[in-house]
Interface confidence: medium
């Protein structure tokens, strides 16, 4: 008799998920010498232990604590780049500006980036058919809880000037419901963080508006100011030129506004 399997609204676990996590861990510990002590098999076991045999709508931050402990990592707290709805450019930036870090430049973020995973209650199987969708099914699913946990820890670790890259092409440049808006903003520590500097990335070439005056940016400024953190904002009118100037800052065209 075929066993009944819960059908969720979201895509199932990424194919070859265990192999992918293990391979990513090995590669990461290889190129980041300070993480070379990490035992990747133990990391996978802790990752698996967070969601296997558990109801995929009943996952807690506590479930991920063994993994968090194994993945403990010190990044320069004054070199943190947060992002919202503009991941690719943020990652391109830290690939060039290698002394700055997004969450996905840390071991745990690197392991899970772009992956989906979930298990089933009372069975050791990974569900490759479907996983809970955050909106349609439940918010306490393995993927959402993971990112909430690591994002909170990442924000808590930040100090001095923290940068955030925001997508100026979206209707809500700052979205209170994004991971940045709902988790990271509220976990920056005012006793450590002096300033949050937003970089608003423009989409259109002819877009010369000052998006730092957008109502959602003003809302972000208000939230941050109430938390006793200073706020500043910059328009990045030409993201392509911005990246080029990060690569070649001595270029004569890089003195003008980007």
């Amino acid at each position: 008799v075929p066993r009944w399997r819960q059908q969720w609204s979201g895509p199932g676990t990424t194919k070859r998920f265990p192999e992918t996590v293990l391979a990513r861990c090995v590669k990461y510990t290889e190129i980041h010498p300070e993480m070379r002590h990490v035992d990747c098999q133990s990391v996978w076991d802790a990752f698996k232990g967070a969601f296997i045999s558990k109801h995929p709508c009943n996952i807690t931050e506590e479930d991920y604590q063994p993994l968090m402990k194994l993945g403990t990592q010190t990044v320069p707290c004054n070199k943190i780049l947060l992002w919202s709805r503009i991941k690719d450019l943020a990652h391109q930036f830290t690939q060039v500006q290698r002394d700055m870090f997004t969450l996905e430049d840390t071991l745990l973020g690197y392991l899970a980036d772009d992956l989906t995973w979930c298990g089933e209650f009372n069975t050791s199987k990974i569900n490759y058919q479907s996983c809970p969708d955050w909106r349609k099914d439940c918010s306490n699913n393995p993927v959402s809880v993971f990112w909430k946990t690591v994002s909170r820890r990442f924000a808590e670790a930040a100090c001095d000037v923290v940068h955030v890259m925001l997508n100026g092409s979206r209707s809500k440049i700052f979205d209170k419901n994004s991971t940045f808006g709902s988790v990271e903003v509220h976990n920056l520590q005012p006793e450590k963080v002096q300033t949050l500097e937003a970089w608003v990335i423009h989409g259109g070439r002819e877009d010369s508006r000052d998006l730092c005056q957008d109502p959602t940016i003003k809302e972000l400024e208000s939230i941050i100011s109430k938390r006793n953190i200073q706020f500043s904002c910059k328009n990045i009118y030409r993201p392509d030129k911005f990246l080029q100037c990060v690569k070649n800052p001595e270029d004569s065209s890089c003195t003008s506004e980007i």
Epitope: V26, K27, E30, I31, H32, P33, E34, R36, P76, Q95, Q97, R98, D99, D105
Partner: antibody, heavy 120, light 110 residues
């Protein structure tokens, strides 16, 4: 010790494969084996590395595409070079970054080098 | 690309004197201290002098001293001897498995 072989006089456009051989030890899983070159009278230039245990490879941006580093046994690593030009004329060194203890991120073992000359 | 700029070159020193070589990185090196210094003499492979910015390699005289952090590094050779005549290179490691060498500084001993 490390020793390079395969250096030769070749014509522009030719391909060549260099070999790095370890003597007295085999590459541990964390060992990085790399190639560095030095044009006559010029400075050192990093080309590529391979990690013994995973065969993951890392290249200088200029070397991607024309140069391929491979591990062929527990004691040998090769560097395949294609579409050679006069600018590739150099002594090619094999170098090791052991990645043990505090030995990380630098080359503590070098071969004597092998000369590659590209000329018509 | 990561660029390491060495100055000055060449540098001249009298026996018994002191030589200072600077190495400036276009970006912070890995962990702010993944920088090594090498000595190279004609016809020979480079020889490791300093690693982790300031740690003396085995068998290297204490006359050689490395210092610095982030993007600015210095190699100081005190009580220079005629055998110190060579070309000196800095070498950095960057996240992502990237290595880079400085352009080299020739030390001439008078």
């Amino acid at each position: 010790s490390l020793e390079e072989s395969g250096g030769d006089l070749v014509k522009p456009g030719a391909s060549l494969t260099l070999t790095c051989t370890a003597s007295g030890f085999s590459f541990s899983s964390r060992y990085w084996i790399c190639w560095v070159r030095q044009a006559p009278g010029k400075g050192l230039e990093w080309i590529a590395c391979i990690v013994a245990g995973t065969t993951n490879t890392y290249y200088a941006s200029w070397a991607k595409g024309r140069f391929t580093i491979s591990k062929t046994s527990s004691t040998t690593v090769t560097l395949q070079m294609t579409s050679l030009t006069a600018a590739d004329t150099a002594t090619y060194f094999c170098a090791g970054d052991p990645r043990t203890g505090s030995n990380v991120g630098y080359f503590n073992l070098w071969g004597p080098g092998t000369l590659v000359t590209v000329s018509s | 690309a990561q660029v390491l700029t060495q100055t000055p070159s060449p540098v001249s020193a009298a026996v018994g004197g002191t030589v200072t070589i600077n190495c400036q990185a276009s970006q912070s090196v890995y962990n702010n201290n993944y920088l090594a210094w090498f000595q190279q003499k004609p016809g020979q492979p480079p020889k490791l002098l300093i690693y982790s910015a300031s740690t003396l390699a085995s068998g290297v005289p204490s006359r050689f001293k490395g210092s610095g952090s982030g993007t600015q590094f210095t190699l100081t050779i005190s009580e220079v001897q005629s055998d110190d005549a060579a070309t000196y290179y800095c070498q950095a490691y960057y996240s992502g498995g990237i290595y880079a060498f400085g352009g080299g500084t020739e030390v001439v001993v008078k």
